[in-house]
Interface confidence: low
């Protein structure tokens, strides 16, 4: 008869024996033997392990470096890593959020479709017909052209994606 080749969930195989894994937040000190259980110890301050494991060292919490525009969004525990995010006006350059860049602004002719967050950049969209944006902004959406008719005025100059229409008074001679 052969020793086991696989162990149950939350166990690992060593020396033909199934040993308990250490729970999240704890590291392995010594494997189990025929006579003793697996020995685990809690991770230290600023360390974590987020899975059932047989790691002999805990991982260091991520450092949110303010020089890179980072700040702590969620403090790490013995079972979770620190989550970083970016300072106001900045967003992460990657999913791991290791550094930040300034939110991009949408140029004239483009409006903000989605305002940037700590983890995503501004999403711009071209202003469709009937809308315009005349500024470079990270917040401004495309604005609709002014409706001259509602002001009892007429269009004197057509609008573009970068400029509003220009309204003027009605031509009285045409009455």
């Amino acid at each position: 008869p052969e020793p086991p080749t696989a162990c149950r969930e939350k166990q690992y195989l060593i020396n033909s024996q199934c040993c308990s894994l250490c729970q999240p937040g704890q590291k392995l000190v010594s494997d189990c033997t025929e006579f003793t259980e697996t020995e685990c110890l809690p991770c230290g301050e600023s360390e974590f392990l987020d899975t059932w494991n047989r790691e002999t060292h805990c991982h260091q919490h991520k450092y949110c470096d303010p020089n890179l525009g980072l700040r702590v969004q969620q403090k790490g525990t013995s079972e979770t890593d620190t989550i970083c995010t970016c300072e106001e006006g900045w967003h992460c350059t990657s999913e791991a959020c290791e550094s930040c860049v300034l939110h991009r602004s949408c140029s004239p002719g483009f409006g903000v479709k989605q305002i940037a967050t700590g983890v995503s950049d501004t999403i711009c969209e071209p202003c469709p017909v009937g809308f315009f944006s005349n500024v470079s902004s990270a917040f401004e959406k495309c604005h609709p052209w002014t409706s001259c008719e509602t002001k009892d005025l007429v269009v004197q100059q057509a609008g573009t994606n970068k400029t509003d229409v220009v309204c003027g008074p009605q031509d009285r001679l045409r009455a």
Partner: antibody, heavy 124, light 112 residues
Framework: EVQLVQSGGGVVQPGRSLRLSCAAS????????MHWVRQVPGKGLEWVSV????????YHAESVKGRFTISRDNSKNILYLQMNSLRPEDTAVYYC?????????????????WGQGTTVTVSS | DIQLTQSPLSLPVTPGEPASISCRSS???????????LDWYLQKPGQSPQLLIY???NRASGVPDRFSGSGSGTDFTLKISRVEAEDVGVYFC?????????FGQGTKVEIK
């Protein structure tokens, strides 16, 4: 069926030797540590010895150290207790027992299977 | 060696009534992994011992749920919620923290 069948007991004179056997069946014998426990008739249980699954590690109680030797033959699925220089105080029922481990969530789960016991009487 | 002291040593019981046995250790059986290395065994008349409880509170396979184990450190208890006639015998606690393993003196449970 998981089973431990013991043999080798009997009446022996002080100073003589005896070898107990414990034949395992119904489980992967080579994966389990094994123990010997004894019981003086009408008295409590006394732990005697343990051997690791591969036979490399052995421990004996102080009362039998240097006289008793635990061993195993994984190819035959048999556990042994070689008892030398027997004394009247070794008179007891001897049990072999399996240390529950491999398939359980915990790597220790008690002495979960016991043999039927074999009687050793040391008397002149 | 670790010493285990059981009480009472004799326990007359009435079928259907609860019963409780104590086991006290000379040192803590709580290991650094958070588990208490104490087992309970029952030896019925003329039979080999059988495992009831391991690691203080885990019921062994096939053991009726009227048996339960509790405690931590040095004080442990085996409870039978409603004693049945087949529960008679000698109950032993055993520490599995250290080699040599050691047993309590045993508690004899008999029907009144």
């Amino acid at each position: 069926e998981v089973q431990l069948v013991q043999s080798g007991g009997g009446v022996v004179q002080p100073g003589r030797s005896l070898r107990l056997s414990c034949a395992a069946s119904g489980f992967s014998f080579s994966s389990y540590a094994m123990h010997w426990v004894r019981q003086v008739p009408g008295k409590g249980l006394e732990w005697v010895s343990v051997i690791s699954y591969d036979g490399d590690n052995k421990y004996h109680a102080e009362s039998v150290k240097g006289r008793f030797t635990i061993s195993r033959d994984n190819s035959k699925n048999i556990l042994y207790l070689q008892m030398n220089s027997l004394r009247p105080e070794d008179t007891a029922v001897y049990y072999c027992a399996r240390r529950g481990t491999v398939t359980n969530y915990y790597s220790y789960s008690g002495l979960d299977v016991w043999g039927q016991g074999t009687t050793v009487t040391v008397s002149s | 060696d670790i010493q285990l002291t059981q009480s009472p040593l004799s326990l007359p019981v009435t079928p259907g009534e609860p019963a409780s046995i104590s086991c006290r250790s000379s040192q803590s059986l709580l290991y650094s992994n958070g588990k208490n290395y104490l087992d309970w065994y029952l030896q019925k008349p003329g039979q080999s011992p059988q495992l009831l409880i391991y690691l203080a509170s885990n019921r062994a396979s096939g053991v009726p749920d009227r048996f339960s184990g509790s405690g931590s450190g040095t004080d442990f208890t085996l409870k039978i919620s409603r004693v049945e006639a087949e529960d008679v015998g000698v109950y032993f606690c055993m520490q599995a923290l250290q080699t040599p393993r050691t047993f309590g003196q045993g508690t004899k449970v008999e029907i009144k």
